[in-house]
């Protein structure tokens, strides 16, 4: 399964769309910066088998998809860009699911790394809580957009390492 290569391209397209989605000047939002505690350690280890690694990436994309599929998100971002972004994420999710199924027969290890997936879930819970506390303000969404762009960039490094392992 050649997921890392195709996923890396999809990741790049998603990042470009995220970059284009900005609606207000981020310079007005400096005081809204927040530490979401990106679970870096879950993307650092070489302990994962390929299927486990893909399942963690899948969870991150799924949570991002969920976050940007809310009505609050629709009210914030330009609809055409949001739709393209969601379509891109959806395609990545489908590719990953197909890839995981392929890998199951190859590996003896469990399909999912439960602790890592839980860490990603909690990370997105913190993001959602922040948006709620900030009443989904334009600046709060700008901070979240910047955070998601950063997490995508960090996961991209993880994917490239995964590809080198093959």
């Amino acid at each position: 399964c050649d997921l890392p290569q195709t996923h890396s391209l999809g990741n790049r397209r998603a990042l470009i769309l995220l970059a284009q989605m900005g609606r207000i000047s981020p310079f007005s939002c400096l005081k809204d910066r927040h530490d979401f505690g990106f679970p870096q350690e879950e993307f650092d280890g070489n302990q994962f088998q390929k299927a486990q690694a893909i399942s963690v990436l899948h969870e991150m994309i799924q949570q991002t998809f969920n976050l940007f599929s809310t009505k609050d998100s629709s009210a914030t971002w330009e609809q055409s860009l949001l739709e393209k972004f969601s379509t891109e994420l959806n395609q990545q999710l489908n590719d990953m699911e197909a890839c995981v199924i392929q890998e199951v027969g190859v590996e003896e290890t469990p399909l999912m790394n439960v602790d890592s997936i839980l860490a990603v879930k909690k990370y997105f819970q913190r993001i959602t809580l922040y948006l709620t506390e900030k009443k989904y303000s334009p600046c709060a969404w700008e901070v979240v957009r910047a955070e998601i762009m950063r997490s995508f960039s960090l996961s991209k490094i993880f994917q490239e390492r995964l590809r080198r392992k093959e």
Epitope: A19, G22, S25, P26, F27, S28, C29, L30, K31, D32, R33, H34, D35, F36, E142, V143, A146, E147, M149, R150, S153
Partner: antibody, heavy 121, light 107 residues
Framework: EVQLVQSGAEVKKPGESLKISCKGS????????IGWVRQMPGKGLEWMGI????????AYSPSFQGQVTISADKSISTAYLQWSSLKASDTAMYYC??????????????WGQGTLVTVSS | DIQMTQSPSSLSASVGDRVTITCRAS??????LNWYQQKPGKAPKLLIY???SLQSGVPSRFSGSGSGTDFTLTISSLQPEDFATYYC?????????FGQGTKVEIK
Amino acid sequence: EVQLVQSGAEVKKPGESLKISCKGSGYSFTSYWIGWVRQMPGKGLEWMGIIDPSDSDTAYSPSFQGQVTISADKSISTAYLQWSSLKASDTAMYYCARHPGLNWAPDFDYWGQGTLVTVSS
Amino acid sequence: DIQMTQSPSSLSASVGDRVTITCRASQSIDGALNWYQQKPGKAPKLLIYFASSLQSGVPSRFSGSGSGTDFTLTISSLQPEDFATYYCQQAYDFPLTFGQGTKVEIK
């Protein structure tokens, strides 16, 4: 290795124009903002302004608004600081530094080596 | 604009001394404060960010504390290479502003 490399020292006359540069390498240039800081001889640090190289959005300190222009060319990972008409009081060391934008990460963690601008008749 | 006031403006100390520099903001900046060290002829170097986080590669003898309007940089045991000028900088809002600096000299 992350690096910000600035253009060399400049000696200019009052009224002349000038554009100094700051080239970033070893990181994604558009993922960080670039700030400019002035240090006049024997004095402290003064923040001048900042640019987001991804879209060239800028913000200036009121003290420098209209006095300088900050720009960037993301295709060559370079930010610029320019003057259209220099004054003797612009004599200073100018530093560029990278900023993580809205991310929770260290501010101004990497700095250029500085560009000394001397304005004298 | 948010004004940043450092004290003292200069101090003399010996190697091994515990040194404390304070920085006060004209309004609350939560924990959005950075500390830099600058040596003559060199670019500033980030020591502490977000009031208390030690920048990678900076010795653990440097520490930062505070929130709101009052902040402190502490050097637990001054080393010969620590003689320099130290600046605080608020990272809360634009325009970003620096303190006037504290020069740490050899006694």
